[in-house]
Every structure is written in structure tokens, then in C-alpha cells.
Interface confidence: medium
């Protein structure tokens, strides 16, 4: 009679994560007698997957009954495969033996490929804002995916980006595998409703890309424009001036006004106005007594933004032109003797 | 190895339906999508749509919504591409071909249909 | 949606001359999803070119493709009878997919 052979037909299988894996197998004789055993992979590190004989494997079932005398098919289902059942099992019959049954015949093995799909892609941003005409990189991960053939693309605004530099590791083979990727994005004065999209194809996802976001309105800081305006004599002596605080992101502002270098008052903004490209403008004003100066006013309309340095801009309020008398025409200078370059 | 094998070629008259079957075979059927593309007599290549054959869900161009319509039998590991009420213009060649990160790394040999009265 | 223009729509090369075939977009095509098919009479097409430089199984490696953007173009260094063909140029980069009208590539 023939000699036993292990037969498993399928050199490699493939299976999506979460799936049930079948892996064949069948002897060609009943002779000898003795029990199956399946590992994944080869030499003495080996790991044993399902033993006929004894052993508890709640993943395992077979797809014959084993206990039936004549039974040659030895073709076991792993359910709820995941990545890292990956590999080649091997279905080998082992020839009774005392005290030890002995190896006999290993089949030719069966390479279990496992489809995953990759995790949703998460998009961050820098730790710290920064301001208009600034390079910013952001760095999108999606991990847990296999096979290893994946493509990633970046988008601002819907328009594709093309100053990225991706990484899919590890280099070698694996049984899932991630992906790296950092993207340049310089800013603009518009990006506050901006967002940076990152993509994801991969053969898992039939033609539905996974996206990741952020919004540039975490990562911008667009500074304020100050102007500072005398307005019309409200009443004898008074004087209304007034500083505004244009297109700023984001709305943490604290404002200060110095008369002749003294704090004369300071307020943080609160009901600001929202533009259209979703910075905000804010308007403060100072009343002036110019009977209580003797000489000309240097009021300045200081300004720290979101934590940054006080930007300032300051404006001259001539006494002399202030008569007691009606005074609606009175000169003033703007002259912004202390402006700083914001940008 | 990988075959997608299509129905074989049709004749029909304006206002009939026709339904054109690709079988998938080599390859797990519900991993990758489907694509449709037409191609009239001497002309260049038209993209169709696709069916996700995970989900069973179509799209259309716009081109080719209406009359037209996608299906699948994934047990049988077919996918199938029905036309009601034929036109004359809806005369060509109609391909399957599969999707993935490979889009179109295998094609089936066409389908010819011929709309005449 | 992005069209797709080749040109030239027909032309003809001699053994051994090099050729290069172009494809012109509509606006900006994913390099990653710029494919090219060959396509001979009475066959399906068979993918060619993907990803616009990366030759599929079994291409010559007399066969190159470059480009980025809007512009893509499929370079043959030496001409062999075996390539008559046409050739169609492919972008999967935004809904609707659409193909380029093809080259028709005679030999002399």
C-alpha cells in the first residue's frame, strides 16, 4: 500500500479580518494510525493551532467529524481571523507512539494572507498656532491595514496638495502595516474656515476613500490691523477716541489704553463682529476730559493677541487745539508714533 | 488564475431589455469592486459606473442613470449590467472590469450588443 | 468632471524609433490615479501603465510614463511591431472617472 500523504491544496488563502479562514487538508491512507495536528509555521518554534487529540482551541473547528474511524479530511475553520493570525500553517499527521505519538508526514503548508482595513485616518496639526505666509506641516496615521499596498493623498479646501512626504511601515513583510504621511500647508489670511483633508485607498475599501480632517481654525493666528480715530467733541472738553481692532483669529484679545504712557483701562473683547472669512473685528473707545491735561495727550491703544507680544498704535491729541468753546473742529494727528509691524 | 468571463454577444430591438452577466473567478469576488465601460463601434472607452460588490451598492455617471442598472449575485460571484428600453445609440462593446487599488488590472472579453430594428 | 486629451489621436513609427504618446487634463490628476491601457483590435483592454509610472506585469520595459498635474505622457524607447496598439490614458483621481479618446500607434 501507497505511503500516507498530507495533501493541502491551497498554497495560499486570503481572508478578510473578522472572517472565518478554511484551511484543507486530507490524508491519502488511514495508516498509520495517529492524530492530527495543525501549527503555524515550521522548526521548533512553531505554534500549535489545533490537536486532534487533546487540547482546548475555541477558535478552531473542524469541518469533518474527526471521530469518525474512516475519516481522511482534516480541514480546520479559524473563525474571527485578524491580522496577526497571519502566516503558513501546517497540517501534520502524527503516528501513534508510546509514551509520545511521533511525527509522521507534514503537508505542504498553507499561506493565510489577512485582508484588513485600515483604521479611520487621524489628522494633527502643530502643537502651536501660527500666523499667515507660515509653512505648517500636518502628519496624518491610519494603521492596522494589510495587505501592504495602500495610497494616500492630501487635499486643502478640495484642491489637491502635492508637497507631502509618506511612509508605509514596516518595510519588510508584516502582518498589518501603517502609514505615515506629513503635508506642507502654507497658511493665508483666508484659511480661518479652511480644512486639511487627508485620504485613504485602499484595496479593502472598494473605491470609498477613509478620510481624516482639521481645521485650519486650530492652527491660524491671523493678528489684528489697529486704527486708532479721534471721533466728533461728544461735549465740552470731552473727547471720544476710538481704536479698531480688525481681522483677528482667534478671539482671546485683551486691550489696553495708556494716556501719556499710564494705564488708563483695559477690557478683553467680547461682543465682537464675525466676517465673512471668519475673523473677527472689535471696536473699543476712550473718553477724553482735555480740561484735566494741561499739555497735548499721547493716548495709545495697546493690544495682546491670543498670548502673543502687545501690538500697539498710538495717536497725539493736541490740547492747544481744544478751546474752551465749541470745539468740532478741532485738529487732531494720527501719528501712529508707535506702531508696530504686526505681520 | 483571475478571469472575469461575460455573456455572450446580443441582439435586440429598440425598446427591449437586455441583462449582461460577468463572472468573477480566481479571486475572492467581495473584495473588489466592479466597473462598467462602454465602448462604441470604433470609438474610445466610456466609464460606467460601479457596483460595490461588498455592499451591493451602485454608482452611476450620469450619463448612464435611468435605463440603466447594476447588480450582483455574489454567491455565484457575478456581477451583472441590465439596459431597459434599448436605444440604437446604446449599440457597443460593454466590458466589466475589476477595481482596487488596481483599477482595471483584469477586464472581461466584452460584450457586443447590437440595438436594431 | 476632467476630460482627458491624447494626442496625437492617430500616428504611425518606424522599428526602433522612440515614441511618445501625451495625455492632457482638464485640471489636476492624482499621479497615483493616472493609468494607461493598451488596447489591441477585437481584445479588451489591458492595463498597461498605473500609478503613471509603474509598468503592470508583463510590459516591456521599453515603455515608460511620467508625468504630474494636467500633464501625462507614455514614452516608448524603441518601437517594436508588437506595440501597435492604442493606447488610452485613465484618471480614477475624481468622480466621474474618465478615459482620454486614445491614441491609434501604427507602425510604418
Known amino acids: 500500500e501507497e505511503e500516507l500523504q498530507v495533501i493541502q491544496p491551497d498554497k495560499s488563502v486570503l481572508v478578510a479580518a473578522g472572517e472565518t479562514a478554511t484551511l484543507r487538508c486530507t490524508a491519502t491512507s488511514l495508516i498509520p494510525v495517529g492524530p492530527i495536528q495543525w501549527f503555524r509555521g515550521a522548526g521548533p518554534g512553531r505554534e500549535l493551532i489545533y490537536n486532534q487529540k487533546e487540547g482546548h482551541f475555541p477558535r478552531v473547528t473542524t469541518v469533518s467529524d474527526l471521530t469518525k474511524r474512516n475519516n481522511m479530511d482534516f480541514s480546520i475553520r479559524i473563525g474571527n481571523i485578524t491580522p496577526a493570525d497571519a502566516g503558513t500553517y501546517y497540517c501534520v499527521k502524527f503516528r501513534k507512539g508510546s509514551p509520545d505519538d511521533v511525527e509522521f508526514k507534514s503537508g505542504a503548508g498553507t499561506e493565510l494572507s489577512v485582508r484588513a482595513k485600515p483604521s479611520a485616518p487621524v489628522v494633527s496639526g502643530p502643537a502651536a498656532r501660527a500666523t499667515p505666509q507660515h509653512t505648517v506641516s500636518f502628519t496624518c496615521e491610519s494603521h492596522g491595514f494589510s495587505p501592504r499596498d495602500i495610497t494616500l493623498k492630501w487635499f486643502k479646501n478640495g484642491n489637491e496638495l502635492s508637497d507631502f512626504q509618506t511612509n508605509v511601515d514596516p518595510v519588510g513583510e508584516s502582518v498589518s502595516y501603517s502609514i505615515h504621511s506629513t503635508a506642507k500647508v502654507v497658511l493665508t489670511r483666508e484659511d480661518v474656515h479652511s480644512q486639511v483633508i487627508c485620504e485613504v485607498a485602499h484595496v479593502t475599501l472598494q473605491g470609498d476613500p477613509l478620510r481624516g480632517t482639521a481645521n485650519l481654525s486650530e492652527t491660524i493666528r491671523v493678528p489684528p490691523t489697529l486704527e486708532v480715530t479721534q471721533q466728533p467733541v461728544r461735549a465740552e472738553n470731552q473727547v471720544n477716541v476710538t481704536c479698531q481692532v480688525r481681522k483677528f483669529y482667534p478671539q482671546r484679545l485683551q486691550l489696553t489704553w495708556l494716556e501719556n504712557g499710564n494705564v488708563s483701562r483695559t477690557e478683553t473683547a467680547s461682543t465682537v463682529t464675525e466676517n465673512k472669512d471668519g475673523t473677527y473685528n472689535w471696536m473699543s473707545w476712550l473718553l477724553v476730559n482735555v480740561s484735566a491735561h494741561r499739555d497735548d495727550v499721547k493716548l495709545t491703544c495697546q493690544v495682546e493677541h491670543d498670548g502673543q507680544p502687545a501690538v500697539s498704535k498710538s495717536h497725539d491729541l493736541k490740547v492747544s487745539a481744544h478751546p474752551k468753546e465749541q470745539g468740532s473742529n478741532t485738529a487732531a494727528e494720527n501719528t501712529g508714533s508707535n506702531e508696530r509691524n504686526i505681520y | 488564475q483571475i478571469q472575469l468571463v461575460q455573456s455572450g454577444p446580443e441582439l435586440k430591438k429598440p425598446g427591449e431589455t437586455v441583462k449582461i452577466s460577468c463572472k468573477a473567478s480566481g479571486y475572492t469576488f467581495t473584495h473588489y469592486s466592479m466597473h462598467w465601460v462602454k465602448q462604441a463601434p470604433g470609438k474610445g472607452l466610456k466609464w460606467m459606473g460601479w457596483i460595490n460588490t461588498e455592499t451591493a451598492e451602485p454608482t452611476y455617471v450620469d450619463d448612464f442613470k435611468g435605463r440603466f442598472a447594476f447588480s450582483l449575485e455574489a454567491s455565484a460571484s457575478t456581477a451583472f449590467f441590465q439596459i431597459n428600453n434599448l436605444k440604437n445609440e446604446d449599440t457597443a462593446t460593454y466590458f466589466c472590469?475589476?477595481?482596487?487599488?488596481?483599477?482595471?488590472?483584469?477586464w472581461g472579453q466584452g460584450t457586443t450588443l447590437t440595438v436594431s430594428s | 468632471q476632467i476630460v482627458l486629451t491624447q494626442s496625437p489621436p492617430i500616428m504611425s513609427a518606424s522599428p526602433g524609433e522612440k515614441v511618445t504618446l501625451t495625455c492632457s487634463a482638464t485640471?489636476?490628476?492624482?499621479?497615483?490615479?493616472l493609468y494607461w491601457f493598451q488596447q489591441k483590435p477585437g481584445s479588451s483592454p489591458k492595463l498597461w501603465i498605473y500609478s503613471t509610472s509603474n509598468l503592470a506585469s508583463g510590459v516591456p520595459a521599453r515603455f515608460s510614463g511620467s508625468g504630474s498635474g494636467t500633464s501625462y505622457s507614455l514614452t516608448i524607447s524603441n518601437m517594436e511591431p508588437a506595440d501597435a496598439a492604442s493606447y488610452f490614458c485613465h484618471q480614477w483621481s475624481s468622480y466621474p472617472y474618465t478615459f482620454g479618446g486614445g491614441t491609434k500607434l501604427e507602425i510604418k
Open positions: 485640471s489636476s490628476v492624482s499621479a497615483s490615479y
Open positions: 472590469a475589476r477595481g482596487g487599488l488596481r483599477q482595471g488590472d483584469y
